[in-house]
């Protein structure tokens, strides 16, 4: 798919505006930045993730 633009203007600690990151990144609300993002790797539990990196970004989880 098309790569998302990396947006680095979000610096407000209270901001709730989603930040778009590129395909291999996701938004980390702790550091208010786009960072490298990996797929979940938890074979020992029932938890799985079908999301690709960078999808459905909402900056409200850390």
């Amino acid at each position: 798919g098309a790569r998302r633009l990396r947006v680095r203007s979000q610096r407000s600690r209270d901001s709730s505006v989603p930040t778009q990151c590129n395909q291999t990144e996701c938004f980390d609300p702790l550091v208010r930045n786009c960072v490298s993002c990996e797929l979940f790797h938890t074979p020992d539990t029932g938890h799985t993730s079908s999301l690709e990196p960078g999808t459905a970004l909402q900056p409200q989880e850390g």
């Epitope: 680095r8 610096r11 600690r13 996701c26 938004f27 980390d28 609300p29 702790l30 550091v31 208010r32 930045n33 960072v35 490298s36 993002c37 990996e38 797929l39 979940f40 790797h41 539990t45 938890h47 993730s49 999301l51 690709e52 990196p53 960078g54 999808t55 459905a56 970004l57 909402q58 900056p59 409200q60 989880e61 850390g62």
Partner: antibody, heavy 125, light 107 residues
Framework: EVQLVESGGGLVQPGGSLRLSCAAS????????IHWVRQAPGKGLEWVAW????????DYADSVKGRFTISADTSKNTAYLQMNSLRAEDTAVYYC??????????????????WGQGTLVTVSS | DIQMTQSPSSLSASVGDRVTITCRAS??????VAWYQQKPGKAPKLLIY???FLYSGVPSRFSGSGSGTDFTLTISSLQPEDFATYYC?????????FGQGTKVEIK
């Protein structure tokens, strides 16, 4: 293999300075955030500072703000903690750690997955 | 800052026991909680991230649950190597804050 190695700790007098280094291997620090966490003798963990080396954005605990400076040299894949105006209460083992993010519907599901071995800073006269 | 309050601060248990440690956040932190294990003289090790996801290589006897303000770390059957201090940490917002720790000792 991901590895973080701290150095630079030691004995320093109150009011003195030290610079800690955190040399990373097995990953590129510009892709993650790097954190310093300290642990005073017999006490719990206290976050000190973080940096996103890709753009130099930083933040600090109130207890060290204005005295400590976190920085990174991406060409050396190394993060630093410059500690000035040191106080007795800064005595601790200092760890650097990498924060990893996993993709989730809310963005980053993150935690500090790799830690260095720690370096002891003792502030005493 | 968000305060993380762990309980108990220490506990004594035997090998094979089921152990539960709780952590309460002073405000909603969604599922942005991790759990770490630390042994004396060693760096912390990540056990659980995002409240309930088992980190790679961690034995399945460890599990985490919770969201919002109340979180739990459970060890289903305590093993000799599990005697250590456990910390919760929130990373919902900066500054990331740790609980005060729970020391699990041999009964």
């Amino acid at each position: 293999e991901v590895q973080l190695v701290e150095s630079g700790g030691g004995l320093v007098q109150p009011g003195g300075s030290l610079r800690l280094s955190c040399a990373a291997s097995g990953f590129t620090i510009s892709s993650n955030s790097i954190h310093w966490v300290r642990q005073a003798p017999g006490k719990g963990l206290e976050w000190v500072a973080w940096i996103t080396p890709s753009d130099g954005n930083t933040d600090y605990a109130d207890s060290v703000k204005g005295r400590f400076t976190i920085s990174a040299d991406t060409s050396k894949n190394t993060a630093y903690l410059q500690m000035n105006s040191l106080r007795a209460e800064d005595t601790a083992v200092y760890y650097c750690a990498r924060r990893v993010c996993y993709s989730s519907v809310r963005g980053c599901a993150g935690a500090m997955d790799y830690w260095g071995q720690g370096t002891l800073v003792t502030v005493s006269s | 800052d968000i305060q993380m309050t762990q309980s108990p601060s220490s506990l004594s248990a035997s090998v094979g026991d089921r152990v539960t440690i709780t952590c309460r956040a002073s405000q909603d932190v969604s599922t942005a909680v991790a759990w770490y294990q630390q042994k004396p003289g060693k760096a912390p090790k990540l056990l659980i991230y995002s409240a309930s996801f088992l980190y790679s290589g961690v034995p399945s006897r460890f599990s985490g649950s919770g969201s919002g303000t109340d979180f739990t770390l459970t060890i289903s059957s305590l093993q000799p190597e599990d005697f250590a201090t456990y910390y919760c940490q929130q990373s919902y917002t900066t500054p990331p804050t740790f609980g005060q720790g729970t020391k699990v000792e041999i009964k």
